[in-house]
Interface confidence: low
């Protein structure tokens, strides 16, 4: 008798490993014999597809080598023309041993930054990821976390984080290990022991010590009054990432000695500096404010204002006088916001000659202040309006720093060129005669508070200087 098909063994969920065989069984009772078709995710599986084997009159479907893309719902449908077609469905769950798809790589990182070591995995069930540092499992803490992706994130990297790391991916089917990678922590150069200042007698030997550390170990160079050390012997030793440098000097003149520690991080360098002064006991006259030395001006800001190869006074109350005084000029110019074309060259000349004062070499190098008359010319004539604005801002506390207070001289405290013509310095850029005055527009309605005497004439034009920095 004809009998409609009945599926006697419904399909079940099948778990299969990648590259293994997976079989679905769809046992059917019917008369006449049914036609059985198979679908995966509702798409018909073709009989001639070589990845599958269909046997036992279609009742057995075998996937010959499972791939992870074979995941899905498989259905068999039986029909023999008697009654309706019947269907049974089951899932194929492709199980997969853990696989590390993006392994960690060697990392170099600067101390204090954030490091991320990747470890992206595949697998079913989803693998859990842990990390090994050296030979021990890595313990998470408030800086070190394994992220959901499996990556290892280290905040505020410390020296002790350096070492060998590997990630481990684990599920019920197995374990995968990444190759071992290296985390290298680089540390900016840092001076541990700065050289000490000495006051010695002429002809003494002095040893300056400078100790620095960093990763990689820094190199140490010594600078004497802004130039590479020309005399003296240097001894160095390195132990446990600490470099110790000793500079032995035979003292015949005072000087500023700077120890510079430098190390390299990729394309960038980090440096640390420390300075010491060597003074000679017999030379130290009681001139409290005049601690410094004469040197040629080698900066940029005042290049166009100071005479070529000008000998300027460098104040050793700063650790790095050239840099500090250059910064003072720069800051002062930037803080004088609105400056007229008439005022600008005059202000530049005044600032440069005030901060980099002419230097009188001798037993005690001495700075030569600007003559009062030139200072007043800038204040009351060339820059009257601007000076008022600046003084008002100073009183109202609108400046970001106190630096500008050092940058602008108090004219009344400067020596007059009538007292002693050699005791003060002139500003050649401001020399003018009465004819020149007629060309300037009036800049203040009030009469200058101090009579500005005639300044000596000069054959050079009044404003031959072109500013290196704009003050606007």
């Amino acid at each position: 008798l004809p009998k409609a098909p009945v599926i006697t063994t419904p399909l079940e969920t099948v778990d299969a490993l990648v590259e293994e065989v997976a079989t679905f069984m769809c046992a059917v009772e019917s008369y006449p014999q049914p036609e059985i078709s198979w679908t995966r995710n509702k798409i018909l599986i073709k009989l001639f597809d070589t990845r599958y084997s269909i046997r036992e009159n279609g009742q057995l479907l075998t996937i010959l080598s499972v791939e992870d893309s074979d995941d899905g719902i498989y259905c068999c449908t039986a029909n023999n023309g008697v009654g309706g077609a019947v269907e049974s469905c089951g899932a194929l769950q492709v199980k997969m041993k853990p696989k590390i798809t993006r392994p960690p790589i060697n990392v170099k990182i600067i101390e204090g930054l954030k490091a991320v070591l990747p470890c992206t995995t595949m697998g079913n069930p989803k693998p859990s990821v842990s990390w090994i540092k050296g030979d021990s499992p890595l313990r998470e803490n408030s800086r070190i976390a394994v992220l959901e992706s499996g990556s290892l994130r280290i905040h505020n990297v410390q020296k002790e984080d350096a070492g060998q790391y590997r990630c481990v991916a684990k599920n019920s089917l197995g374990t995968a290990y990444s190759k071992v990678v290296k985390l290298e922590v680089e540390v900016f150069a840092r001076i541990l022991r700065a050289p000490e200042s000495h006051n010695v007698t002429f002809g003494s030997f002095v040893t300056l010590h400078c100790t620095a550390t960093g990763i990689p170990v820094p190199t140490i160079t010594w600078i004497e009054n802004g130039n590479a050390v020309s005399s003296g012997s240097i001894q160095e030793s390195v132990k446990d990432r600490v470099i110790d440098s000793r500079l032995q000097l035979f003292i015949t003149k005072p000087g500023l000695y700077t120890c510079i520690a430098t190390n390299k991080h990729g394309e960038k360098f980090s440096t640390a500096k420390a300075a010491a002064t060597i003074s000679i006991a017999e030379w130290s006259k009681p001139q409290k404010d005049n601690k410094g030395y004469c040197a040629q001006y080698r900066g940029e800001v005042c290049n166009a204002v100071l005479a070529k190869d000008a000998l300027v006074f460098l104040n050793t109350s700063y650790a790095d006088p050239e840099e500090a005084q250059e910064l003072l000029v720069h800051t002062a110019w930037n803080e004088l916001k609105v400056v007229s074309p008439v005022c600008r060259p005059a202000a530049e000349a005044l600032l440069c000659n005030h901060i980099f004062q002419e230097c009188s070499p001798g037993v005690v190098p001495t700075p030569i202040p600007i003559c009062r008359e030139y200072c007043l010319a800038v204040k009351e004539l060339f820059c009257a309006k601007e000076w008022l604005v600046m003084e008002e801002k100073t009183h109202r506390g609108l400046y970001r720093s106190e630096m500008h207070l050092l940058s602008v001289p108090e004219c009344s405290k400067l020596p007059s060129m009538h007292w002693d013509p050699t005791a003060c310095a002139r500003l050649p850029h401001l020399d003018y005669n009465k004819e020149n005055l007629k060309t300037f527009p009036p800049m203040t309605s009030s009469k200058p508070s101090v009579d500005i005497p005639n300044l000596p004439s000069s054959s050079s034009s009044s404003f031959s200087v072109s500013p290196t920095y704009s003050m606007t």
């Epitope: 859990s128 998470e140 803490n141 408030s142 800086r143 976390a145 394994v146 992220l147 959901e148 905040h155 505020n156």
Partner: antibody
Framework: QVHLVQSGAEVKKPGASVKVSCKAS????????MHWVRQAPGQGLEWMGW????????SYAQKFQGRVTMTRDTSISTAYMELSRLISDDTAVYYC???????????WGQGTMVTVSS | SYVLTQPPSVSVAPGQTARITCGGN??????VHWYQQKPGQAPVLVVY???DRPSGIPERFSGSNSGNTATLTISRVEAGDEADYYC???????????FGTGTKVTVL
């Protein structure tokens, strides 16, 4: 918008347990530690511990070891703090807090008042 | 365990500068964070990693840290700055977070 929203106030008897929840939104919950901090009335802040929502790893302050359990449910981006064997000194506001990319706590829950009274 | 000590209270007139200290053994080697807490509210981070400010925190709040003392400075103090302030560090040796004792800032 990043938010941590905590469960409502609780009143418990001494010896009982309390479980406070903290639901995160606006950021990847599993990417950052969740900390718990408490503050007794008129007192300062006291750190209780943290949980790594991804791995479930925890670290508890010595004082609460054995009494506190921190758990999480990543499917609903929620962290839990359970404190057992309550005493009256546990009366406090309990906060959850997290640090999104920095080691400080830059996001806090609104706090949950837990009162322990017989 | 690591201890952070703060003065219980600091009083300051509007427009003046308030300085709150946080003392701890060699605290200069640690990152210090500062929180402001107003009555009935959750704490708010005002300075982290010694001197960095989260977005939205005024420039009037600044921090420094060296030796055995960290300092939170509030310049040009306003009435709205009246609150409790807490310092906090992560103690590497115990892997625990530690809060300071707290300082009440009163604007006169």
């Amino acid at each position: 918008q990043v938010h941590l929203v905590q469960s409502g106030a609780e009143v418990k008897k001494p010896g009982a347990s309390v479980k406070v929840s903290c639901k995160a939104s606006g950021y990847t919950f599993t990417g950052y530690y969740m900390h718990w901090v408490r503050q007794a009335p008129g007192q300062g802040l006291e750190w209780m511990g943290w949980i790594n929502p991804y791995s479930g790893g925890t670290s508890y302050a010595q004082k609460f070891q054995g009494r506190v359990t921190m758990t999480r449910d990543t499917s609903i981006s929620t962290a839990y703090m359970e404190l057992s064997r309550l005493i009256s000194d546990d009366t406090a506001v309990y906060y959850c807090a997290s640090g999104l990319g920095i080691s400080a706590f830059d996001i806090w829950g609104q706090g949950t008042m837990v009162t322990v009274s017989s | 365990s690591y201890v952070l000590t703060q003065p219980p209270s600091v009083s300051v007139a509007p427009g003046q500068t308030a300085r709150i200290t946080c003392g701890g053994n060699n605290i200069g080697s640690k990152s210090v964070h500062w929180y402001q807490q107003k009555p009935g509210q959750a704490p708010v981070l005002v300075v982290y990693d010694d001197s960095d400010r989260p977005s939205g925190i005024p420039e009037r709040f600044s921090g420094s840290n060296s030796g055995n003392t960290a300092t939170l400075t509030i310049s040009r103090v306003e009435a709205g700055d009246e609150a409790d302030y807490y310092c906090q560090v992560w103690d590497r040796s115990s892997d625990h977070y530690v809060f300071g004792t707290g300082t009440k800032v009163t604007v006169l």
